[in-house]
């Protein structure tokens, strides 16, 4: 009779994580008597996966009734495959004895595990940035195998090109991670914008995974200020308004100063939202002109989202009829202590 051969017909087998892997092995002869063992890897450090003779291998089942002498099929099924199971598996025939001695090995079957990438996590900068600034977004996904993977960045559906991507580790591994950093230039219209990281992998069957970041969490649009005055019914009263336009986020505090002295402070509440996601707000002062002997410098000072205050001033002429005028001068600390001013916001 011809000498026994151990046949592993599959050079490689690819299995999705969580599934079972069937590793085929047959022998060509019933002699010599002795057990079959399966190993992962070769050499002295090889790992025992299954021993026909003894041991407890809860994830391994034999495909045929391998306990019987007439059996020549020693294929095994390994359940609940994880990326850690990847490697080359050898079916090895031993000759019965004290000890059992290795008689012949199969050529090996390489098991590769297809593992899905985790959902991409997109993170933006720690601090908000203003339009025209470039900010960086990172995207991370882990645990996938094989290594080949495609990552794309989009802003509102438009593909971005300014990004760098790394897949780690560089060498062989049971699973891999991807890390990508994209640079995005902010515009004033980006409050409603989204940055999307899209990951495509063989395990996803053409349905890529996406991670998103809302630029509303990244952008700060500073307000523009406009101070105007309108006459009111009574000849000696003037209505001065401060229009705070196109700001984001909503957190805003406004202070009126009369000749450099704080007159009133209020927090933006009943704001109106623009189509682009920014907000507008208006605050007004009713000034009794007759109560002033000298000209009055009214300053609208706005502190937006914890940033340094910006202000707009308006010189109210007491001697002449009120007329609209404004200046960008900073508030002065000099001025009358006499007050006769009423205010509101809307």
């Amino acid at each position: 009779e011809e000498e026994l051969q151990v046949i592993q017909p599959d050079k490689s087998v690819s299995v999705a994580a969580g599934e079972s892997a069937i590793l085929h092995c047959t022998v060509t002869s019933l002699i010599p008597v002795g057990p079959i063992q399966w190993f992962r890897g070769a050499g002295p450090a090889r790992e025992l996966i299954y021993n026909q003779k003894e041991g407890h291998f809860p994830r391994v089942t034999t495909v045929s009734e391998s306990t019987k002498r007439e059996n020549m099929d020693f294929s095994i099924s390994i359940s609940n495959i994880t990326p850690a199971d990847a490697g080359t598996y050898y079916c090895v025939k031993f000759r019965k004895g004290s000890p059992d001695t290795e008689f012949k090995s199969g050529a090996g079957t390489e098991l590769s595990v297809r593992a899905k990438p985790s959902a991409p996590v997109v993170s933006g900068p720690a601090a908000r940035a203003t339009p025209q600034h470039t900010v960086s977004f990172t995207c991370e996904s882990h645990g996938f195998s094989p290594r080949d993977i495609t990552l794309k960045w989009f802003k509102n559906g438009n593909e971005l090109s300014d990004f760098q991507t790394n897949v780690d580790p560089v060498g062989e591994s049971v699973s891999y991670s991807i890390h990508s950093t994209a640079k995005v230039v902010l515009t004033r219209e980006d409050v409603h914008s989204q940055v999307i990281c899209e990951v495509a992998h063989v395990t996803l069957q053409g349905d890529p995974l996406r991670g998103t970041a809302n630029l509303s969490e990244t952008i700060r649009v500073p307000p523009t200020l406009e101070v105007t005055q309108q006459p009111v019914r009574a000849e000696n009263q003037v209505n001065v308004t401060c229009q705070v336009r196109k700001f984001y986020p909503q957190r805003l505090q406004l202070t009126w100063l009369e000749n450099g002295n704080v007159s009133r402070t209020e927090t933006a509440s009943t704001v109106t939202e623009n189509k682009d996601g920014t907000y507008n707000w208006m605050s007004w002062l009713l000034v009794n002109v007759s109560a002033h002997r000298d000209d009055v410098k009214l300053t609208c000072q706005v502190e937006h989202d914890g940033q340094p205050a910006v202000s707009k001033s308006h010189d109210l002429k007491v001697s002449a009829h009120p007329k609209e005028q404004g200046s960008n001068t900073a508030a002065e600390n000099t001025g009358s202590n006499e007050r006769n001013i009423y205010g509101g916001s809307g």
Epitope: E1, V33, G34, Q52, E54, E70, S98
Partner: antibody
Framework: EVQLVESGGGLVQPGGSLRLSCAAS????????MHWVRQPTGKGLEWVST???????YFPGSVKGRFTISRENAKNSLYLQMNSLRAGDTAVYYC????????????WGQGTMVTVSS | DIQMTQSPSSLSASVGDRVTITCRAS??????LAWFQQKPGKAPKSLIY???SLQSGVPSKFSGSGSGTDFTLTISSLQPEDFATYYC?????????FGQGTKLEIK
């Protein structure tokens, strides 16, 4: 059903010969090692002989040179030729199959009695 | 030849008892050990092979353990049909050899 049936036992004088047969059914006979085991009345079991799939044979010292084992796969039959029989060979002779991968005996026949006496 | 020594030679026990029979080999037999049950006038029946593997169709109340030279057969809860003679056998090295047997009797 897997079955082994021995035959050929009987009374024989010391120095005489006897040929035991074992008819196998219910399995692929050629794929299994086969064994003979005996048991003197009221005593324990003693292995007598093995024939492998390839026809290789094995005996203990107590019967070597006197007993021969053979198989006829086409007839699903196992044989034990016993020559130069002694009183100490008196026993029930069982045919058994090496049914497991490791050649452990899994199926036994009902036995046939061999008595060596003058 | 490898000597197989069983103990005890006989054992009295009651229905429901848990009993253990031991078998010692004179040298390492690499777990190639079988256990058999034999009732009077009947052929031996295989229970265990390679020291701890349960033969097909054998109830799980029978279990085998051990390695190297020392082995045990345990019957977890004796039933009337379990009273019989039990033999161990090494089949690692020719000549295959049996223990002298342990007779399990009803107390």
């Amino acid at each position: 059903e897997v079955q082994l049936v021995e035959s050929g036992g009987g009374l024989v004088q010391p120095g005489g010969s006897l040929r035991l047969s074992c008819a196998a059914s219910g399995f692929t006979f050629s794929s299994f090692d086969m064994h003979w085991v005996r048991q003197p009345t009221g005593k324990g079991l003693e292995w007598v002989s093995t024939i492998g799939i390839a026809g290789d044979t094995y005996f203990p010292g107590s019967v070597k040179g006197r007993f021969t084992i053979s198989r006829e796969n086409a007839k699903n039959s196992l044989y034990l030729q016993m020559n130069s029989l002694r009183a100490g060979d008196t026993a029930v002779y069982y045919c058994a199959r090496g049914g497991n991968w490791d050649d452990a005996l899994d199926i036994w026949g009902q036995g046939t009695m061999v008595t060596v006496s003058s | 030849d490898i000597q197989m020594t069983q103990s005890p030679s006989s054992l009295s026990a009651s229905v429901g008892d848990r009993v253990t029979i031991t078998c010692r080999a004179s040298q390492d037999i690499n777990n190639y050990l079988a256990w058999f049950q034999q009732k009077p006038g009947k052929a031996p029946k295989s229970l265990i092979y390679t020291a701890s593997s349960l033969q097909s169709g054998v109830p799980s109340k029978f279990s085998g353990s051990g390695s190297g030279t020392d082995f045990t057969l345990t019957i977890s809860s004796l039933q009337p049909e379990d009273f019989a003679t039990y033999y161990c056998q090494q089949y690692n090295t020719y000549p295959y050899t049996f223990g002298q047997g342990t007779k399990l009797e009803i107390k």
